[in-house]
């Protein structure tokens, strides 16, 4: 049974304030069951950066669309870039449940962002 | 083509068991959730159980006496339904899940089912 | 448990003639309703996904609308072929997945 896997391919994204973060993460299996949600830095000071089923996240939208079919792509991409968007931003597996569980984490990306140039 | 044959059942008295299976074909069974939907005589569709890797979700109304279960080696999906009643009589479905977007599941391809009749 | 109410029950119907299908769910499900139909003898055959996505090979008179809690199925002109029962499904909140009861079209 091969496993699922949380794919982060980059390691780190640099983007000049203003201008618009694509963080990429696919995943290898449509199972288990269950949620996919975005998170800036880890444990349990975490913040959420993204999670379609509830909340509101103005700055952030998926990349792929929405009506696709058993989509296996969950990139983000994040507008208006500011300095205060810097950190390592994961993506997360979660199983359904009553509370959905976490399952598997992405390798994390290093957003930094670069002054604006004049 | 997508292609889920059921098979299994049949006539059984109250309290006894009976095992339906499902075979898939024509898509990467492994990487989908699959389910089970069940329609009593003249009724409407209720579902019943679905399945994602060791995941497993059932309705109320079959918990503790139905279980889920698959064999990706054989692309083959299972209902071990135990202590059954009269209520359960119905035809079965098998179904493929399919998700769209960031959201839960819908059924996008269907067997032809399978008749359980429970009556003593 | 999320309940869908389908209405009406029964709708009696010559063919050619426009009909609409509703779908009323107890709480908000925001646009994650699918609609089936289901011949006599027949499985259940997904017709539309995520309130308005045609699924592959379905004519484009049929037309799914839509969000929260009010949903509506509408077939343009209704073919022969077109007569069943067809029924809602939510998949926002669940377990359970639940359906609405179906609406029968009949030939009138």
């Known amino acids: 049974e091969e496993e699922l896997q949380v794919i982060q391919p980059e390691k780190s994204v640099s983007v000049a304030a203003g201008d618009s973060a694509t963080l990429n993460c696919t995943v290898s299996s449509l199972i288990p069951v269950g949620p996919i949600q975005w998170f800036r830095g880890a444990g349990p000071g975490r913040e959420l950066i993204y999670n379609l089923k509830e909340g509101h996240f103005p700055r952030v939208t998926a990349v792929s669309d929405p009506t696709k079919r058993n989509n296996m792509d969950f990139s983000i991409r994040i507008s208006n870039i500011t300095p205060a968007d810097a950190g390592t931003y994961y993506c997360v597996k979660f199983r359904k449940g009553s509370p959905d569980v976490e399952l598997k984490s992405g390798a994390g990306t290093e957003l930094s962002v670069r002054a604006k140039p004049s | 083509d997508v292609q889920l044959v059921e098979s299994g059942g049949g006539v059984v008295r109250p309290g006894e068991s009976l095992r339906l299976s499902c075979a898939a074909s024509?898509?990467?069974?492994?990487?989908?959730?699959m389910s089970w939907v069940r329609q009593a005589p003249g009724e409407g569709l209720e579902w019943v159980s679905t399945?994602?890797?060791?995941?497993?979700y059932y309705a109320d109304s079959v918990k503790g006496r139905f279980t889920i279960s698959r064999d990706n080696s054989k692309n083959t999906l299972y209902l071990q339904m135990n202590s059954l009643r009269a209520e359960d009589t119905a035809v079965y479905y098998c179904?493929?899940?399919?998700?769209?977007?960031?959201?839960?599941?819908?059924?996008?391809?269907w067997g032809l089912g399978t008749l359980v009749t429970v009556s003593s | 448990e999320i309940v869908l109410t389908q209405s009406p029950a029964t709708l009696s119907v010559s063919p050619g003639e426009r009909v609409t299908f509703s779908c009323r769910a107890s709480q908000n499900v925001r646009s994650d309703i699918a609609w089936y139909q289901q011949k006599p003898g027949q499985a259940p055959r997904l017709l539309i996904y995520a309130a308005s996505s045609r699924d592959t090979g379905i004519p484009d008179r049929f037309s799914g609308s839509g969000s929260g809690t009010d949903f509506t199925l509408t077939i343009s002109s209704l073919q022969s072929e077109d007569f069943g029962v067809y029924y809602c499904q939510q998949y926002y909140d669940w377990p359970p997945f639940t359906f609405g009861g179906g609406t029968k079209v009949e030939i009138k």
């Open positions: 024509g898509f990467s069974f492994s990487i989908y959730a």
């Open positions: 399945i994602g890797a060791d995941d497993t």
């Open positions: 179904a493929k899940d399919s998700t769209v977007g960031w959201s839960g599941d819908f059924f996008d391809y």
